[in-house]
Interface confidence: low
């Protein structure tokens, strides 16, 4: 029998009646077009729904949009289109929701061709009221909020002007022309690239990187010969054209662009690309594309300055610039990432790291699964996860892998069990320990979501036929109950629950189709009565994360410390609640070689924890560029992994000496940088 359908599964008592009393239908008075949904604020219950419908006429397309608001997590909606004067809203800009709980919303309207500028509707009270504002420019991008101050907005215009507002979009000022890309940094700083000659495209590789720290009063040029730039964690990256040829290299700054160092990464040619896969304040995962149209590259992990890099994973699947990669941060357990590699025979395999890219392994075969046809040995195979690449290839995969920081250890994903990803219809698998072990959770493809910090998992079968059944589990996917939420099946389009997985409400979106019309409909189900009581101390159990060998004192040590979590027992049917905070208890570990990456010029042979010198660098002085000076590195091959907190134990020595030589690598050295004021 399928998982969760055998006799020992305990039933949740009277759940049909409890759910029926908490199922709310809303039929939208709309012809079916497109629908977009945004949550406004955290734990506010406010949802905005924008429906748009295009009527193709002979000469032009006539558009109509409607705006709906719910303040009870989607149980009831009110048509508030009149608050935006029945204006057609441009869906490509989406709804720009302010950071944190600012309650701010910006909608960008469609305006007629001859108008001087665009039009926006602004709300700062969680969409209860809107103010119409005509813009002195036509926006090219969605309004971007400063992460530090939601009153500060920036936008690019269709004429490549950089516009800033200091009063939440009421008044706008063009602070610079000829801008290609602009991003907010920390402390309300704006970074942007400018072109001098023709256009962004024509000047690619000859752009300048600018910074303003006072919203456009003064500027500083912080880089030239720029191809592109990016921000990740506390790092500012720029890819810079080399002097002699068409290659480019990554430079990195940790002081907002005042000083730069050349990253110890391979240079790339015109057809190649760099991509920041993940970044935090400690380190960066960087993908470097392989020459040629291979569809793969190499993942490198940085040191704490973003300068020295270690090779982390070869043949990493990443199709083209801005293309597809399966790289996934498993947010439910520290240090865990999943991605795909393209093997020599062009099959795709899933790899997982538990130590922030130090080592990668295949996923363990689920106990309750057999190896499929891709497996050469029917007893030995692995789980392979479907992610962005599979979705882009139109495989029968409705969702990417899912994990939530407050649902500790839980990872849900579509997958197949064999030697490589299979094109067969996938099943859904779950891990409750952050990816170390897996179990088949549901047969066939499903949509899934996590509620109440993991207390409930909800799933809906992915089907081309109309559906009216939802499945839910209160024991992390071991046992499933099915609930018929409507008599009349609907064409399902999506599951929506409040971001953060703390809610107990789930909205099922779809449309009904009759002979004459089709209409949007949503069903919101509140699971509060299924989880009747609040969880108590006895409902939780202690769980040691990353535990692989309980006999070992260093068991669970990852990045120099271990963490014990209080986790809800699978058998407990109770509410974690909206205020649930993950309880964890860390303890520091002794340092071992596993706590060190191989330094510049060193590598780790497979299945060995020792770092050995790269043959081509043997006997050479290790010199590299740091803050525009040449440095000499004295090392025995190790450097501490960024974020590693181990103490004591082994302690390899590392020393960096300043050679007092300049090495600006054609990049602006700090003393040559210019400033100007408006």
């Amino acid at each position: 029998s399928a998982p969760g359908e055998d006799e020992e599964c305990g039933r949740v008592r009277d759940f049909v009646a409890k759910l029926a009393n908490n199922t709310h239908q809303h039929v939208f008075d709309d012809l079916r077009g497109s629908v977009s949904l945004s949550w406004v604020g955290d734990s506010t219950g406010v949802i905005l729904v924008l429906t748009t419908f295009h009527v193709p006429l002979v000469i032009m397309t006539f558009g109509q949009s409607k705006l709906y608001r719910s303040e009870d997590y989607g149980k009831n909606f009110k048509d508030i289109t009149d608050l935006i004067n029945n204006t057609f809203i441009r869906t490509e800009f989406g709804m720009a929701i302010g950071p944190e709980n600012s309650g701010k919303v910006v909608l960008t309207a469609e305006v007629s061709g001859g108008s001087r500028g665009g039009r926006i509707f602004r709300s700062s009270d969680f969409a209860k009221n809107f103010v119409q504002t005509d813009l002195p420019f036509h926006p090219l991008t969605q309004m971007m909020y400063s992460p530090q101050n939601s009153d500060y907005l920036l936008a690019l215009s269709t004429e490549n002007g950089l516009w800033v507002s200091k009063n939440f979009g009421g008044k706008w000022e063009e602070i610079h022309k000829a801008v290609c890309l602009a991003k907010w940094g920390s402390d309300n700083t704006i970074f942007f690239t400018t072109y001098a000659n023709g256009s962004c495209k024509a000047d690619l590789g000859a752009l300048e990187l600018w910074r303003t720290s006072d919203l456009g009063k003064s500027f500083k040029t912080i880089g030239v010969k720029i191809y592109s730039f990016g921000l990740g964690g506390r790092f500012l990256f720029a890819s810079v054209m080399a002097d002699k040829d068409t290659t480019r290299r990554i430079h990195v700054s940790t002081d907002q662009g005042d000083t730069w160092s050349m990253a110890q990464l391979p240079s790339v040619g015109q057809e190649q690309f760099y991509s920041i896969l993940a970044a935090n304040d400690d380190m960066v995962f960087m993908h470097v594309d392989e020459p040629g149209d291979t569809g793969f590259g190499t993942i490198f992990t940085s040191d704490d300055r973003g300068i020295v890099y270690s090779k982390s994973l070869d043949r990493h699947l990443y199709t083209t610039t801005g293309g597809e990669t399966d790289f996934t941060n498993v947010t439910s357990l520290r240090g865990v990432y999943i991605t795909s590699v393209l093997s020599e025979d062009n099959s795709i395999q899933t790899m997982i790291t538990f130590d922030q890219g130090g080592r990668w392994t295949h996923l363990r075969k689920p106990e309750n699964s057999e190896c499929d046809a891709t497996a050469k040995n029917k007893n030995e195979c692995s789980l392979h996860i479907h992610a962005s690449y599979s979705i882009s290839q139109k495989l029968n995969v409705p969702m990417a892998p899912l994990s939530e920081p407050n649902a500790v250890g839980i990872v849900i994903a579509h997958g197949s069990v064999g030697d490589a990803i299979s094109v067969m219809v996938p099943d859904v698998y779950i891990s409750d320990d952050g990816g170390y072990s897996w179990t088949k959770m549901l047969e066939g493809p499903h949509y899934y979501t996590i509620l109440d910090s993991g207390g409930i998992i909800v799933a809906i079968e992915h089907s081309s036929r109309p559906i009216n059944v939802i499945k839910f589990s209160t024991d992390e996917g071991q046992c499933w109950q099915t609930y018929t939420f409507t008599r009349d099946p609907i064409y399902f389009t999506g599951l929506a629950s409040e971001p953060g997985a703390r809610s107990m409400n789930i909205s099922i979106w779809g449309f009904t189709e009759s002979f004459l019309t089709s209409q949007w409909v949503s069903y919101t189900i509140d699971f509060k009565d299924i989880l009747e009581r609040n969880c108590e101390e006895k409902d939780y159990t202690i769980w040691l994360a990353h535990s692989t060998d309980p006999e070992d004192y260093e068991d669970g040590c990852i990045l120099g410390y271990k963490e014990q979590f209080l986790r809800l027992r699978k058998s407990s049917v109770c509410q974690n609640g909206r205020d649930y905070v993950v309880t964890k208890q860390p303890s520091i570990c002794l340092c071992s070689l596993e706590d060190f990456l191989c330094d510049f010029g060193y590598y780790r042979p497979e299945n060995d924890s020792k770092c050995v010198e790269q043959p081509e660098l043997k006997g050479h002085d290790l010199e590299f560029c740091l803050y525009g000076r040449e440095e000499h590195l004295t090392t025995n091959g190790y450097r501490k992994i960024p974020g590693d907190k181990c103490q004591g134990g082994v302690n390899p020595v590392r020393e960096v000496k300043d050679l007092k030589k300049k090495c600006t690598s054609n990049f602006l050295s700090p003393e040559k940088q210019n400033s100007k004021s408006n």
Epitope: P550, E551, D552, Y553, E554, Y561, Q585, P586, S587, I588, C589, L590, Q647, G648, G649
Partner: antibody
Framework: EVQLVESGGGLVQPGGSLRLSCAAS????????MSWVRQAPGKGLEWVAT????????YYPDILKGRFTISRDNAKNSLYLQMNSGRAEDTAVYYC??????????WGQGTLVTVSS | DIQMTQSPSSLSASVGDRVTITCRVS??????LAWYQQKPGKSPKLLVY???NGADGVPSRFSGSGSGTDYTLTISSLQPEDFATYYC??????????FGQGTKLEIK
């Protein structure tokens, strides 16, 4: 019932050596870390050494490193403490304790070691 | 190394009294703390582990509390058999796993 029985204590000359043993019973010995703790006459408890369940990892306070060696024989359910270069300040009752990680949950009755000429 | 400061070093109380012993630690040990009871001529006995969890078979009048750097052992109603010396010990991170200097609880 968990039982830990220390033996091997006695009088030893300064600079001399002694090997203490601890026989464990009533639990699965090879899945627990084990520790030695000592108590000088009229004084408080002092942690001496710890060994991981498989015997791979050993831990000592800096002042005892190099003189004391903790070991175990999981086949015999036995824990050992080798004391070398005995000093007067090593005079104490030595306890062996089961050490699952966040506490020492069972203790032996102790064995007295006296370092004196 | 982490320093443990146990107070008071000695304490006189009567049967039925509520008694509190504190252990202050030189850095955050994230509740990695145990309490032991030792009677004269006997080996120590575990009372509380992970700061707040009572060990098996320990009477409910013994309870642990605290977090960060400050921890407390409370005996809600002192019984004759509770007169003994009490020790705290941390298990935070790497050794040494130091003990407090002890609190001697005597009959008033």
């Amino acid at each position: 019932e968990v039982q830990l029985v220390e033996s091997g204590g006695g009088l030893v000359q300064p600079g001399g050596s002694l090997r203490l043993s601890c026989a464990a019973s009533g639990f699965t010995f090879n899945i627990y870390g084990m520790s030695w703790v000592r108590q000088a006459p009229g004084k408080g408890l002092e942690w001496v050494a710890t060994i991981s369940s498989g015997g791979i990892y050993t831990y000592y306070p800096d002042i005892l490193k190099g003189r004391f060696t903790i070991s175990r024989d999981n086949a015999k359910n036995s824990l050992y403490l080798q004391m070398n270069s005995g000093r007067a300040e090593d005079t104490a009752v030595y306890y062996c304790a089961r050490h699952p990680g966040g506490a020492m949950d069972y203790w032996g009755q102790g064995t007295l070691v006296t370092v004196s000429s | 190394d982490i320093q443990m400061t146990q107070s008071p070093s000695s304490l006189s109380a009567s049967v039925g009294d509520r008694v509190t012993i504190t252990c202050r630690v030189s850095e955050n040990i994230y509740s990695n703390l145990a309490w032991y009871q030792q009677k004269p001529g006997k080996s120590p006995k575990l009372l509380v582990y992970a700061a707040t969890n009572g060990a098996d078979g320990v009477p409910s009048r013994f309870s642990g509390s605290g977090s960060g750097t400050d921890y407390t052992l409370t005996i809600s109603s002192l019984q004759p058999e509770d007169f003994a010396t009490y020790y705290c010990q941390h298990f935070w991170g790497t050794p040494p796993w130091t003990f407090g200097q002890g609190t001697k609880l005597e009959i008033k």
